[in-house]
């Protein structure tokens, strides 16, 4: 008789990443009988929710349901109906909601409450919506990339299944850049983590890991830009801000009320003799870089070594995966190649920032002007953060790998979050069975 395929014994999980600038829904899939194996979970879909981050709905919370509809419908289409009720759904909100909570716990709770009610209307197994901590965001990002890179697998392989594989079990560090925060997470080499807040201990697949992590709130690319503008307008002689981080010829009017809306600019707030000011781009990388460095307080450090703002940072160790906005920005600037040195990146940024705004608009006609106008700042910020903030050097730059996806799954905290909440990363190495179940009879 002819072999007949048995129904696929798979499971699904959904995680929504409610970031400061947008929300993304990820659908993951794995073979049910291999739940505890490393590297079996993979992403089958990403749906980017159309619109801004959920914190922007604070004045119209009743519309959050509409905002989420399209991607939740997509999940309903992708996941077989028979699996809907057993598919867990998790929503994790990050720094945008942390900032809203700092302003008003009540408003943040109201937003999350409506999110929960909206997601509960779908036929999935909704497991809750919460604001994750910066430490969790860093830790889960680190788990994700190392899980996908096969670093937790004890089996030695004679072939390489993933890019960046260094054929050893040394984990990669994780560098995550969002709109409102940035995370750095890695295993230091035989170094005591001097600050308990930055220390994590994991036992994964039978191995102990002592991990350093820190999340810098307000140092995501969007909030860093607001900080820089608030700092620079303090010393402007009038309502014109000549800004080296924007292309020559670029002009934009900014409301002072918008500038001071975020808690991230509170330290620079002052009474200004105008309600609006105009940014006029002058496109100078070096001056932009200098202006950005003023956001990093390196004048005091209560530890043996710090990143900035008095935050402990051990000596960098090993390779790093830089993802989320680190990747998106560098990808846009065509600077993700392993062969591009730090000096070359700086050179390219100097050229890019100096290009006239009219020329840039013509070259990238399909890109929204708001996004397009900010790539000079974002690229310069990434260099400043990595070099002066985290102390990468021209030599150690080659250890940074700008990563969008690994094995078809997005690099980011969501996969690690789901693996943890579904107990799919065992503390001990699972006993391997000699044969897996055949899918054919």
């Amino acid at each position: 008789t002819q072999n007949k395929a048995l129904p696929e014994n798979v499971k699904y999980g959904i995680v929504l990443d409610a970031g400061s600038s947008h929300t993304s829904l990820y659908i993951y899939k794995w073979p049910a009988e291999k739940e505890n194996d490393t590297g079996v979970v993979h992403q089958v879909e990403e749906c980017r929710v159309k619109g801004p981050g959920i914190s922007k709905f604070v004045q119209k919370v009743n519309e959050i349901g509409i905002y989420l509809t399209d991607c939740m419908e997509r999940a309903r289409e992708v996941i077989p109906r028979s699996q809907h009720q057993e598919t867990p759904v998790y929503l994790g909100a990050t720094a945008g909601m942390r900032l809203l909570r700092m302003e008003s716990e009540e408003l943040a709770d109201r937003v999350l409450d409506v999110v929960e009610r909206s997601l509960s209307n779908y036929p999935f197994d909704f497991q809750g919506a919460r604001i994750i901590t910066g430490q969790e965001e860093g830790a889960y990002g680190w788990i994700t990339i190392n899980y996908l890179l096969g670093k937790f697998s004890q089996k030695t392989r004679w072939f390489s299944i993933v890019p960046y594989e260094t054929n050893n079990q040394e984990t990669f560090g994780a560098l995550d850049l969002g709109g409102a925060s940035t995370q750095v997470t890695f295993v230091p080499q035989n170094q005591t983590i001097e600050s308990p807040d930055n220390a994590l201990q994991f036992r994964l697949y039978g191995k102990d890991y002592n991990v350093y992590t820190h999340s810098f709130l307000c140092y995501g690319k969007d909030q860093a830009l607001w900080q820089k503008l608030a700092k620079d307008i303090q010393v402007a002689s009038n309502e014109i801000l000549r800004d080296p981080c924007f292309h020559p010829g670029y002009k934009k009017v900014v409301n002072v009320s918008d500038l001071y809306k975020t808690p991230c600019t509170k330290r620079f707030e002052m009474t200004l003799p105008f309600q609006q000011f105009e940014i006029q781009g002058i496109g100078n990388y070096q001056q932009c870089h200098q202006s950005i460095l003023e956001l990093f307080n390196t004048s005091y450090c209560p530890y043996s070594q710090c990143a900035f703002n008095g935050i402990f940072l051990p000596p960098l160790q090993g390779d790093f995966g830089a993802f989320s906005a680190f990747y998106f920005v560098m990808k846009f600037l065509n600077l993700t190649s392993e062969k591009v040195s730090q000096e070359k990146v700086t050179e390219m940024m100097k050229k890019f920032c100096a290009q006239p705004w009219e020329e840039i608009k013509t070259s990238y006609a399909g890109v929204k002007e708001k996004y397009l106008s900010e790539y000079c700042f974002s690229g310069t910020y990434i260099l400043s953060l990595l070099l002066q903030g985290y102390h990468f050097t021209a030599d150690s730059w080659e250890h940074i790998h700008f990563i969008g996806k690994i094995q078809g799954s997005d690099a980011g905290w969501t996969l690690g979050y789901m693996l943890n909440l579904t107990n799919m990363i065992p503390a001990e190495q699972p006993l391997s069975t000699p044969l897996s179940h055949s899918t054919y009879v």
């Epitope: 879909e45 990403e46 749906c47 980017r48 159309k50 619109g51 801004p52 922007k56 709905f57 004045q59 119209k60 009743n62 519309e63 349901g65 509409i66 905002y67 509809t69 399209d70 419908e73 997509r74 309903r76 289409e77 209307n121 399909g366 890109v367 929204k368 708001k370 996004y371």
Partner: antibody
Amino acid sequence: EVQLLQSGPEVVKPGATVKISCKVSGYSFTDYNLNWVRQYPGKNLEWVGNIDPYSGGTRYNQKFKGRFTITIDQSKNTAYMELRSLTSEDTAVYYCGLYGYDDDANYFDDWGQGTMLTVSS
Amino acid sequence: EIVLTQSPAILSLSPGERVTITCSASSSVSYMHWFQQKPGQAPRLWIYATSNLASGIPARFSGSGSGTEYTLTISSMESEDFAVYYCQQRSSYPLTFGQGTKLEIK
């Protein structure tokens, strides 16, 4: 300001294939789904399908699946709909449109001016 | 698919009159949207998410409802309100429209 500019009217014979276009400007092309809707002269509106330019994923009304195909050319900021095996029943105005929330969470809904397709022998 | 049934199909009335158009869904939807269309023009969003007026829409228009029953109300008809109104659901695919209600001058 979001604008959707559709290609001009088409007159074709039954059985023919036609491709109509919708060029968008004023926003990032990958930010919103692009929908196609058709309307018989003076009659009902019917959703044909949509495309998510971010992922490339498409959805269709079952009624049109297989005969109508929605595609995009990101470099041109343009969406297309190819209509095959046309009959007189396909004579209608075809609209492209998009909707969603902007960066300030304001809801918007924009339509192209419509493309009149006449199928006649 | 979710079928939307509007009533009435045609309504003849005079300026100043109060009007209520209903839209019934064959199964529950989370929100309803309403469009106005005038001859030779593309439809224009009028009310979104059941009760929110789109930008520039006069306050004499209102929307309400939940589940399977939704209404659009005009408190006092004005000459520019004579048009065809369509309801649409965007809660599940395929997206569907009502068959339209034509408001004409008596």
